[in-house]
């Protein structure tokens, strides 16, 4: 069984306020089964940005078609970026259970927000 890896290729992404940010995440295996979630920040204060299991998340769309049964691309686009969105974003695989438990995390992508061009 191939060990699941979570690849967040971009260490950092810089976006102008008002634009959309694309945060890339791919996984290398579908197993163990369970949802992908995105968080801003780490630890108990982290903020849920996207959960494959539930929605909607009005400002967040998936870049690829996650309803494909073999999909391994969980990149997201966050629209209308503001300075409050700055931070490090983690793509995390959960293993199914009651409740689902965190299985593996990507290394994180730091989002910085530039001032809107005048």
């Amino acid at each position: 069984e191939e060990e699941l890896q979570i690849i967040q290729p971009d260490k950092s992404v810089s976006v102008a306020a008002g634009e959309s940010a694309i945060l890339h995440c791919t996984i290398t295996s579908l197993f163990p089964v369970g949802p992908i979630q995105w968080f801003r920040g780490a630890g108990p204060a982290r903020v849920l940005i996207y959960n494959q299991r539930q929605g909607p998340f009005p400002r967040v769309t998936t870049v690829s078609e996650t309803t494909k049964r073999e999909n391994m691309d969980f990149s997201i686009s966050i629209s209308n970026i503001t300075p409050a969105d700055a931070g490090t974003y983690y793509c995390i695989k959960f293993r199914k259970g009651s409740p689902d438990t965190e299985f593996k995390s990507g290394a994180g992508t730091e989002l910085s927000v530039r001032a809107k061009p005048s």
Epitope: F31, V33, P35, R53, E65, T67, K68, K96, S98
Partner: antibody, heavy 118, light 107 residues
């Protein structure tokens, strides 16, 4: 109110074709994968085919591969099943079902009866 | 293939458990589907192993462990008489399968 309404069933002769339709309402059809499931008289449920939300990816059980084609028209909120070279073994009630994020089913149509008889 | 008992019976108010075996916990999610009469529309009572749709009474619950899933009806009622099909999605094959169904009789 979420609704799935199948149509297109009827009586056909062996070797003939039939196209089933499923009209969806009450949810954002283009965001969900969909499937067709059938139930032969006195038998259990049998999954036949699934299609991703955008329609680019399709999946079939081996016994209908090459004879049945699942498709969708998101602009019409409609799901289809084209059935060719029908045999008596295809006699069943055919249901369309909405898929959950992990390809189980949360809502079902009322079904449409297909009878293949000479 | 998914295996489940052909029939179970219970008195009103009792707890019923229906076990479905044959999947791989590592790659499989389970669901449970209620059909009150042959050819009528199935109703999803559990999906994703243990998730109950909002319109399903709380007496229905689901769990999964190892190679089996369990549907539990706590305080069964006469109106719960039906055939219950377990279903599974296997992420290895991209295929959905169903058990043969369990007829629940409430005495």
């Amino acid at each position: 109110d979420l609704q799935l309404v199948e149509s297109g069933g009827g009586v056909v002769r062996p070797g003939e074709s039939l196209r089933l339709s499923c009209a969806a309402s009450g949810f954002t059809f283009s965001s969900y994968a969909m499937s067709w499931v059938r139930q032969a008289p006195g038998k259990g449920l049998e999954w036949l085919a699934g299609i991703s939300a955008g329609g680019s990816d399709t999946y079939y059980i081996d016994s209908v591969k090459g004879r049945f084609t699942i498709s969708r028209d998101n602009s019409k909120n409609s799901l289809y099943l084209q059935m060719n070279s029908l045999t008596a073994e295809d006699t069943a009630v055919y249901y369309c079902a909405r898929e959950t994020w992990n390809h189980l089913f949360d809502y079902w149509g009322l079904g449409t009866l297909v009878t293949v008889s000479s | 293939a998914l295996t489940q008992p052909a029939s179970v019976s219970a008195n009103p108010g009792e707890t019923v458990k229906i076990i479905c075996s044959g999947g791989d916990y590592y790659s499989t999610y389970y669901g449970w589907y209620q059909q009150k009469s042959p050819g009528s529309a199935p109703v999803t009572v559990i999906h994703s192993d243990d998730k109950r749709p909002s319109d399903i009474p709380s007496r229905f619950s689901g769990s999964a462990s190892g190679s089996a899933a369990t549907l539990t009806i706590t305080g069964v009622r006469v109106e719960d008489e039906a055939v219950y099909f377990c279903g599974a999605y296997d992420g290895r094959t991209y295929i959905n399968t169903f058990g043969a169904g369990t007829t629940l009789t409430v005495l």
